[in-house]
Amino acid sequence: RPSRVYKPEGNTKRALTLKDILNGTFSYKTYFPNWISEQEYLHQSEDDNIVFYNIETRESYIILSNSTMKSVNATDYGLSPDRQFVYLESDYSKLWRYSYTATYYIYDLQNGEFVRGYELPRPIQYLCWSPVGSKLAYVYQNNIYLKQRPGDPPFQITYTGRENRIFNGIPDWVYEEEMLATKYALWWSPDGKFLAYVEFNDSDIPIIAYSYYGDGQYPRTINIPYPKAGAKNPVVRVFIVDTTYPHHVGPMEVPVPEMIASSDYYFSWLTWVSSERVCLQWLKRVQNVSVLSICDFREDWHAWECPKNQEHVEESRTGWAGGFFVSTPAFSQDATSYYKIFSDKDGYKHIHYIKDTVENAIQITSGKWEAIYIFRVTQDSLFYSSNEFEGYPGRRNIYRISIGNSPPSKKCVTCHLRKERCQYYTASFSYKAKYYALVCYGPGLPISTLHDGRTDQEIQVLEENKELENSLRNIQLPKVEIKKLKDGGLTFWYKMILPPQFDRSKKYPLLIQVYGGPCSQSVKSVFAVNWITYLASKEGIVIALVDGRGTAFQGDKFLHAVYRKLGVYEVEDQLTAVRKFIEMGFIDEERIAIWGWSYGGYVSSLALASGTGLFKCGIAVAPVSSWEYYASIYSERFMGLPTKDDNLEHYKNSTVMARAEYFRNVDYLLIHGTADDNVHFQNSAQIAKALVNAQVDFQAMWYSDQNHGILSGRSQNHLYTHMTHFLKQCFSLSD
């Protein structure tokens, strides 16, 4: 046979293909321990066994076999805190972003068999164990039920639940998406005695209705109570029930602070402080005032009391309260004082220690960077993440503050661990932070490691993506740069993805990928092999992502610049960046495009219609086209109300439809799923109508029965193939 010809390794590398992306060939793994104690955790192995690990004894064994999992087609599990039972979750059926229904089976680990008798109804909307023992709370048909033991008959806590009307223990659409970001609205007290829950009354909320075509002769109509900007909102009430004898007093309502209850308001979160102390957070409908209320159980009254002197007010004078959401408190061991992230006098979000009043808060961190999340507060340490290190807003490092020391000393736990590979971390802590896992998302290959909570010493690599590393050896990956550009007094961070054989002396087509929503961040030091990676690798397109005004973690001046005027600076800053990129000399001015999804679709549409002539073409996937069409909680947070005496004028001026004429000189591809529960198809329908009325030619694609994510495999393949063809045509790239 002919001898093999030696080729230098450099030439054997191939470019990424679209197929690689659509097949998820280069997806990475992370490892999050499912902590069950200070030093023990569970993890689902590659072959679906549930494995128990003890860090200190190095013991590991299968606690639940894959055959047991498979016997009920389980895809998830949950161990009861007394370790006697496991719930197995199957028949997962997605509803909205976080919510889903499922069938649950309870497996008795002592007997090695499923619990028979009083089986759980199906499908269940939410189910969870109590934090102690093996009580179960679950939501079925919008009502909450309690089981004292898995084999016991259930006790029905609420009776008011009604489909699309009243939700107990689970959020309605708008609270799920825009406020709680969870599928649940119930919380056990630490000792499992009390169960707090929210009742959402949607009876007066207008309904969004859209067709779901399915396979039938007639389409189905999906009806969702969905408050758009200015519409009637859900009425919320918080109750707490004593789960030991829930039938005695029944649910006890927690009072709403007076200053909140005087007008429309939101419930924003609940945090148990101790077994008889709870912290509720409320927000005015005009979302610049937040109240944190600490309530105590009065045994003599059998009621929850929320004294006025335990109300803490957080107010923003330059925008909305909080970041994307109002931050939640991290309470100290004393169950009175707490740590919380909010804006300091310079407008940067930092950790503050509140002992009695917010006015007397002690600032714990400071600087022209932001504290992002408090992971854990222990007796002597506070762990948090920030973007302080080396001044890169798109990095995340984990820090420890020794709060026992005076003054508190700060240590960066992650900054120097794997500096080149890892600049963006999250963490997962065991119960009292005796151990923790670090998960690094990039910019290099993600890696998950286990650490000692006292010394921060690395104990073990949990997942290092070796297989992925090996398969990427043969791939010509693009080069990624994160840099900043200045314009006037403004600084914009950008990420540029450059083709593998990039040559500054040549001219390349440029694609701007934009999101740009308030308090979002696109320029992050994370690893990704996705569609834009492919476009750079195979098609030789330069990709740029720019964080303009309104984006997060660079101070309130930058963040609140867009307050009450969405659609202005976000677009302006993308245009500024494009001009700066052109000045760099390697961009072909005749071949510049922009694309975005959701808020990014809104910004890309407005950028294309800016009349600057900068863009040859662009794509908007599932764009918002008017803030009046979007959810009240979101739209009003940033825009106020669409009323004459508030901000109606800018609501009207900031629509995509108002700029229909300006699309005449660009190639525009408009894409939307017809079953989008989030950004309704209505948004694109109105853009299309306006373009037709203006006699402007454009291209469009709808995805029947697809939601905001256009997630089905077939649809995704079609979508990215379609967008690729459109871009290649726009850039005159041969197929």
Partner: antibody, heavy 117, light 108 residues
């Protein structure tokens, strides 16, 4: 000391109406779910109705549903039972009890309702 | 609804004797929701036992409760003269809450 004092009972003709009251003292009335339980002469106990702490949720036995209405006035520490379309089988001593669906830890002395022509 | 059947209907015993009262449910009741009451002639009922086995405030320790599922028992270890009365079991698991028909403990 916890006290529950019922009033408003008496003789009424079938089809008639009565309003029972229960004055509460010695505990935080507004924080307690309350019930009415009745006992026909020489018979056992029968739960009639319950009301949540703030009066938003009310529950009734099938035998009285649509005819009886439970309510409360937390400012007056008083529980009520409006009884309409009374029948002979509604004849009983009516107790007001502290509790929602069980663990009725305090009871009034009862008020007798007699439905007879 | 859950039907509670008490037995015996009447129990004739002497002071100092042990009384065992039974309560059977038509369907399983979680222990948390099973209570026992005592009623003397011309008086309102009095709460004795909650959660199937926990004595209510001020109840002497000669009263004890046990059982689970569908079978529950109230035991009076040594009958005192004041214990002769009618005893009712009650479930609060399911609406409507229901009472047993009662067991009369009388002096033999």
């Amino acid at each position: 000391e916890v006290q529950l004092l019922e009033s408003g009972g008496g003789l009424v003709q079938p089809g008639g109406s009565l309003r029972l009251s229960c004055a509460a003292s010695g505990f935080t009335f507004s924080s307690s779910a309350m019930s009415w339980v009745r006992q026909a002469p020489g018979k056992g106990l029968e739960w009639v109705s319950a009301i949540s702490t703030n009066g938003n949720y009310t529950y009734y036995a099938d035998s009285v549903k649509g005819r009886f209405t439970i309510s409360r006035d937390n400012s007056k520490n008083t529980l009520y039972l409006q009884m309409n379309s009374l029948r002979a089988e509604d004849t009983a001593v009516y107790y007001c009890a502290k509790g929602w669906l069980g663990n009725f830890d305090y009871w009034g002395q009862g008020t007798l309702v007699t439905v007879s022509s | 609804e859950i039907v509670l059947t008490q037995s015996p209907g009447t129990l004739s015993l002497s002071p100092g004797e042990r009384a065992t009262l039974s309560c059977r449910a038509s369907q399983s009741v979680s222990r948390s929701y099973l209570a026992w009451y005592q009623q003397k002639p011309g008086q309102a009922p009095r709460l004795l036992i909650i959660g199937a086995s926990t004595r209510a405030t001020g109840i002497p320790d000669r009263f004890s409760g046990s059982g689970s599922g569908t079978d529950f028992t109230l035991t009076i270890s040594r009958l005192e003269p004041e214990d002769f009365a009618v005893y009712y079991c009650q479930q609060g698991q399911v609406i409507p809450p229901t009472f047993g028909q009662g067991t009369k403990v009388e002096i033999k």
